[in-house]
């Protein structure tokens, strides 16, 4: 009976996500058979989040809207470990929008999910950000410094990275 009601709950939760994510990849969390964490297929997972690399070239605002439709946001990077995970799935000759912007052009950078911008946990390339008109952030590869952030024009189409919380069922 208990297992039946748990299964019903899981099915109803899965139905919520089915519209945007017809397939989920789930793993058992810990030793308890009842706790599963899922990411949409073919998203990748790291800690409590799921990540999707969007290879379509779009402006920053359209990229954020695209993530939003999937129940996600453009990626907010909180730690060096998180960035190190993300870059494993990126192509060196491409640039990818982050969920970081400065719409007022006053160097008040803000994350899309309202996470406070912490100057101590940023990974700007040297000399960046360097242009008040460049109000959106990308992550890209420079041979001298490897992967880091750069400010660019928001309207310039780029690839992007979406991030969402894992789905627990």
């Amino acid at each position: 009976n208990f297992m039946y009601s748990k299964t019903v709950k899981r099915l109803s939760k899965l139905r919520e996500y089915q519209q945007y994510h017809p397939s989920l990849t789930c793993v058992m969390e810990g030793k308890d058979i009842e706790d599963w964490s899922c990411c949409p297929t073919p998203w990748t997972s790291f800690q409590s989040s799921c990540y999707f690399i969007s290879t379509g070239m779009q402006s920053w605002t359209k990229s954020q809207k695209n993530c939003s439709v999937m129940g996600a946001d453009l990626v907010v990077i909180n730690t060096r470990e998180e960035q190190d995970f993300i870059i494993q799935n990126l192509k060196r000759n491409s640039s990818y929008f982050l969920g970081l912007s400065d719409p007022g052009g006053r160097r008040h950078w803000q994350w899309v999910d309202q996470t406070p911008y912490n100057e101590n946990v940023t990974f700007w390339h040297s000399g960046e950000p360097n242009n008040l008109d460049e109000r959106c952030a990308i992550i890209n590869f420079r041979s001298s410094e490897e992967w880091g952030w750069n400010d660019i024009h928001c309207h310039v189409p780029q690839k992007s990275i979406c991030k969402m919380k894992k789905i627990y069922i």
Partner: antibody
Framework: EVQLVESGGGLVKPGGSLRLSCAAS????????MSWVRQAPGKGLEWVST????????YYPDSVKGRFTISRDNAKNSLYLQMNSLRAEDTAVYYC??????????????WGQGTTVTVSS | DIVLTQSPASLAVSPGQRATITCRAS??????????MHWYQQKPGQPPKLLIY???NLESGVPARFSGSGSGTDFTLTINPVEAEDTANYYC?????????FGGGTKVEIK
């Protein structure tokens, strides 16, 4: 006073080349993105190319990509448009315009008087 | 590319009356309360002149009889009251993504 003065237009045969110039004054040229916008006779406005303030970014519509090249010389306060392989449909008045950024986009806050390019055999 | 459709293509208005021009975008040009639609006036033989930026902000030096409104995909430029000197073509332009695109224009004539 902000001023943008275009030059270099003229009559050219199909397949020919022209180089347009835009002399800027009255503002810190190196701090602004710049664009070329054209207007065919009796028609509407068509954006032709953009260059960022730091010269790091240029962009073109498919109609001119590979044929037109935008460039700038911040030391000379000048914007250029090199036009090669010209076609009859490139006939237009070409305006130089200054971009002013606003939030996630921009608008054109100052325009030159334009220079006329005629492509005809 | 985002397509901007202006209507009407032309209109004739008596001095003192209201003129209303609409611009419809093929997709939203708004994001988090910012509307990246702009309006320009072009008189015969002259370059375009900025009137309104970001849907509703009046450019410095532009008479207060010009106003703009709208969000998402639908935007309006209003001239009220129209004066004889307002005879011109009016264009909308979006800048939320490249390439920047212009509407086809609306010709306003004063009766």
């Amino acid at each position: 006073e902000v001023q943008l003065v275009e030059s270099g237009g003229g009559l050219v045969k199909p397949g020919g080349s022209l180089r347009l110039s835009c002399a800027a004054s009255g503002f810190t040229f190196s701090s602004y993105g710049m664009s070329w916008v054209r207007q065919a006779p009796g028609k509407g406005l068509e954006w032709v190319s953009t260059i960022s303030s730091g010269d790091s970014y240029t962009y073109y519509p498919d109609s001119v990509k590979g044929r037109f090249t935008i460039s700038r010389d911040n030391a000379k306060n000048s914007l250029y448009l090199q036009m090669n392989s010209l076609r009859a449909e490139d006939t237009a008045v070409y305006y130089c315009a200054r971009q002013l950024y606003y939030s996630y986009g921009y608008y054109f806050d100052y325009w030159g008087q334009g220079t006329t390019v005629t492509v005809s055999s | 590319d985002i397509v901007l459709t202006q209507s009407p293509a032309s209109l004739a208005v008596s001095p003192g009356q209201r003129a209303t021009i609409t611009c419809r975008a093929s997709e939203s040009v708004s994001f988090h309360g910012t509307h990246l639609m702009h309006w320009y006036q072009q008189k015969p033989g002259q370059p375009p002149k900025l009137l309104i930026y970001a849907a509703s902000n009046l450019e410095s030096g532009v008479p207060a009889r010009f106003s703009g409104s709208g969000s998402g995909t639908d935007f309006t430029l209003t001239i009220n009251p129209v004066e004889a000197e307002d005879t011109a073509n009016y264009y909308c332009q979006q800048s939320i993504e490249d390439p920047p695109t212009f509407g086809g224009g609306t010709k306003v004539e004063i009766k």
